[in-house]
């Protein structure tokens, strides 16, 4: 069964800066990755970035840099101030569309106990079959 993992990290140098890393553990070919915050995409969440393996990468504030790390994992740096700034309990979700498995999504947030600069361990947070 495919899994999606999500890792959220707050940067020690900038407390309003977060790095979200997501990966897909499956054998299929990834066709699209969507990163959202405030809940799953299409269920009240707001899209921060859309990454296609060949067509390109698009992102919207407060996302600063979305990139492919490998063929099956991505990272997104967020920074903000004021209303568009993420906070410690913000939920971030990553949805991977793949062939032939379909769409798989997981969400994660910064663990309450984590210190700035420390990573939350990669969590295959509740995995939702979104298809």
């Amino acid at each position: 069964t495919p899994e999606v993992w999500v890792q959220v990290r707050m940067e020690a140098t900038e407390l309003s800066s977060f790095t979200i890393r997501c990966g897909f553990l499956g054998s299929g070919s990834i066709s699209l990755v969507t990163v959202s915050w405030g809940g799953p995409n299409g269920a009240g969440g707001t899209t921060l970035a859309v990454l296609h393996p060949e067509r390109g990468i698009r992102q919207w504030a407060p996302a600063r840099q979305a990139r492919w790390e490998t063929q099956s994992s991505i990272s997104l740096i967020l920074e903000g101030s004021g209303a568009s700034s993420p906070c410690a309990n913000t939920t971030f979700c990553c949805k991977f569309a793949s062939f032939p498995e379909g769409s798989w999504e997981a969400c994660g947030s910064l663990p309450p106990s984590s210190d700035p600069g420390l990573s939350a361990p990669p969590t295959p947070a509740p995995i939702l079959r979104a298809d």
Epitope: G45, T46, T47, E54, G56, R58, W68
Partner: antibody, heavy 114, light 113 residues
């Protein structure tokens, strides 16, 4: 497949403003993220910016900041582009296109003339 | 901004001929994480909007005839039409799909003798 239907041609006077629309009808969420592209007669294409239907978030080509304003009405699936302080340099065909430019509207011709 | 330079600016060929056009970018369009090139090619026929032909430098969009082939990596890219047809009369544009602003080349005009 997504269809992008743009509003009709506009003829406006220098200094005026105009707002053109692009209605998307598709079946995937990426069909509603809209890019805007300018093409002057006999010239190449220029990316103006894009708009995110979730929250109206935008990205602009620096060249068009202050000239173009991109908005979206998520409920109707319609994106809008406002252009202000129009001059003859703004006379062009303006296209909307989906997130990764795989579908395009038919174009809206803007003529700025006194 | 990434500058896209296309050559030649125009081509005049006979039906059935093989055609090659070039696109060079001022910065690499290769995404190091997944080793994909974010470059697209478009065809624009008179009075029509552009149509996506190729993305990822070499992947044909659905429905595009296989006589159209994209190749290249980094900063140098090529669009090849293996056997030109009369309906291929059009302007061809390359586009940086790597980073904002998503700049287009000046175009290559394909004319049929």
């Amino acid at each position: 497949e997504v269809q992008l239907q743009q509003s009709g041609p506009e003829v406006v006077k220098p200094g005026a403003s105009v707002k053109i629309s692009c209605k998307a009808s598709g079946n995937t969420f990426t069909d509603y993220f809209i890019n805007w592209v300018k093409q002057r007669h006999g010239k190449s294409l220029e990316w103006i910016g894009d708009v995110n239907p979730d929250n109206g978030g935008t990205n602009y080509n620096q060249k068009f900041k202050g000239k173009a304003t991109l908005t979206v009405d998520k409920s109707s699936g319609t994106a809008f582009m406002g252009l202000r302080s129009l001059t003859s340099e703004d006379s062009a065909v303006y296209y909307c296109a989906t997130l990764f430019f795989d579908s395009w509207g038919q174009g809206t011709t803007l003529t700025v003339s006194s | 901004d990434i500058v896209m330079t296309q050559s030649p600016s125009s081509l005049n060929v006979s039906a059935g001929e093989k055609v090659t056009m070039s696109c060079k970018s001022s910065q690499s369009l290769l995404n190091s994480g997944n080793q994909k090139n974010y470059l697209a090619w478009y065809q624009q026929k008179p009075g029509q909007p552009p149509k996506l032909l190729i993305y990822g430098a070499s992947t044909r969009e659905s429905g595009v005839p296989d006589r159209f082939t994209g190749s290249g990596s980094g900063t140098d890219f090529t669009l090849t039409i293996s056997s030109v047809q009369a309906e291929d009369l059009a302007l061809y544009y390359c586009q940086n799909a790597h980073s904002s602003p998503y700049t287009f080349g000046g175009g290559t005009k394909l004319e049929i003798k």
